[in-house]
Interface confidence: medium
């Protein structure tokens, strides 16, 4: 599983006039890290965990980050022309990734009233744009607003992927939390289903880094895939993740099935409660 | 009609702790985006931002001033307070406290003065 | 701390002239830099939020340009009653600081 962060950034234009605040927010691996504070003009921390990643600052370099990239998104926004009356909003979306054979990848997308109109994969400098005209239109704009910018501030995508990508191992390098091995706790339950059946439920929590094997097995075999069902693994909130796996299995055959767990090298078993 | 009043003691002998007060109507600490700052300026001199409470009571101090500082609020009376330990004679200054939503200070008070002497 | 510079200290006009007040941070602070102006024996008065947006009761004389780190301060046509001492804010990064403050003076 990769190491990301991902930027979402949103300004709103109310009457055709560009508002002076904007919205943002910062996940680092999946999980909320960062957002901006409208009100205090502050980036917080998201929870104890983003705290722990940042350390003992005053995270004025996340604020002057997200601030600049508001201010760049707010002129982007006054460059569109089809302001109509009303309120409307652009949205920005950049994602930067490290893999694991230190190979990276970055996107960036737009988005106006919620809809996609405009992608870049920044290491090929491919532009994406969905089929329809509005879409088109946009895309043309902000494209030729972004290319005029760059010029004048001879700036390009790649500098402001080369930036995310800076603060990404930034947060890697510093940070013992995010090269920190926690090891999931386990809980089986079951629940009656049908007569005859019950439904046993495997969930791994509090575990990091995300990538789990969670399976259940019967005689010590995997069971097919398509006879079971899985929970997303979802960040908690606390800067681990969680996920569940469930299977439905006949009344009195529990002692046959286990639910098998992988993590970070680690594995066991854990039996139905009888 | 928004209005801020400080009040405090005048006069103070050095070491002494400064007790400022306040009173604000026409808005609500309890309105989420809410806070009020204190803000002082010594007699012919420049602006000095000193600390700040939130609605949701978190508080923001400027650093080369945070220890001697502590900031309150008591939401239902409307009030702000700012003590500051052990003062000396370079903390002779007009203090303003004043309201701060959107990132500036849109609403002042009419200041109090404060003169520290032995 | 980020660093608030205002320029000149002192500036002296004649009514009816158009002025410009200087103000740079040292380093950027985006557009999240305000205005206000301190009449004598007067509390501070909001005139500018976020370098060039005008503020409800302010006279249209007065108006903000600027971005990053370099930010002015313009009356239009400076009229007698706007002697006083402007001073530009940063509100981008903690702690908030304040300019030392230019003196509009009339001759």
């Known amino acids: 599983e990769p190491h990301s962060l991902r930027y979402n950034l949103t300004v709103l234009s109310w009457d055709g006039s560009v508002q002076s605040g904007f919205l943002a927010e910062v996940h680092l691996d999946g999980q909320p890290f960062l957002r901006y504070d409208r009100q205090k003009c502050r980036a917080k921390p998201q929870g104890q965990w983003a705290e722990d990643v940042l350390g003992n600052k005053t995270w004025d370099r996340e604020t002057r980050d997200l601030t600049g990239n508001g201010k760049d998104l707010r002129m982007t926004l006054a460059h569109i022309k089809d302001q109509k009356e009303g309120l409307h909003s652009l949205q920005e979306i950049r994602v930067c990734e490290i893999h694991e054979d230190n190979s990276t990848r970055s996107s960036q997308h737009f988005y106006y009233d919620g809809e996609l109109f405009l992608s870049q994969n920044v290491e090929t400098e491919e532009w994406t744009v969905p089929q329809s005209s509005r879409a088109q239109t946009l895309a043309m704009n902000v494209r030729n607003f972004l290319k005029e910018d760059a010029m004048k501030t001879k700036t390009h995508y790649h500098a402001m992927h080369a930036d995310c990508l800076q603060e990404l191992r930034r947060y890697l390098e510093s940070s013992v939390v995010l090269r920190r091995r926690v090891p999931p706790m386990v809980n089986v339950t079951r629940s009656e289903a049908s007569e005859g059946n019950i439904t046993v439920t495997c969930r791994a929590s509090s575990f990091y880094p995300r990538n789990i094997t969670l399976t259940w097995r019967q005689d010590g075999v995997s069971l097919s895939h398509d006879t079971q069902q899985w929970g997303d693994v979802l960040p908690d909130g606390n800067g681990t993740y969680q996920t569940w796996v469930a299977t439905r299995i006949c009344q009195g055959e529990e002692q046959r099935f286990t639910c098998y767990m992988e993590h970070s090298g680690n594995h066991s078993t854990h039996p139905v409660p009888s | 009609q928004i209005t801020l009043k400080e009040s405090g003691p005048g006069i103070l002998k050095p070491s002494q702790t400064l007790s400022l007060t306040c009173s604000f109507s026409g808005f609500s600490l309890s309105t989420s985006g809410m806070g009020v700052g204190w803000i002082r300026q010594p007699s012919g001199k420049g602006l000095e931002w000193l600390a700040h409470?939130?609605?949701?009571?978190?508080?923001y101090y400027n650093p080369s001033l945070k220890s001697q500082l502590t900031i309150s609020k008591d939401t239902s009376r409307n009030q702000v307070f700012l003590r500051i330990t052990s003062v000396d004679t370079a903390d002779t200054a007009t203090y303003y406290c004043a309201r701060r939503t959107q990132g500036y200070f849109d609403y002042w008070g009419q200041g109090t003065t404060l003169t520290v002497s032995s | 701390d980020i660093v608030m510079t205002q320029s000149p200290a002192t500036l002296s006009v004649t009514p009816g002239d158009r002025v410009s007040l200087s103000c740079r941070a040292s380093?950027?602070?985006?557009?999240?830099l305000h205005w206000y102006q301190q009449k004598s024996h007067e509390s501070p008065r909001l005139l500018i939020k976020?370098?060039?947006q005008s503020i409800s009761g302010i006279p249209s004389r007065f108006s903000g340009s600027g971005s990053g780190s370099d930010f002015t301060l313009s009356i239009n046509s400076v009229e007698p009653e706007d002697v006083g001492v402007y001073y530009c804010q940063n509100g981008h990064s903690f702690p908030w600081t304040f300019g030392g403050g230019t003196k509009l003076e009339i001759k």
């Open positions: 380093q950027s602070i985006s557009d999240y």
């Open positions: 409470i939130w609605w949701d009571d978190d508080k």
């Open positions: 976020y370098a060039s």
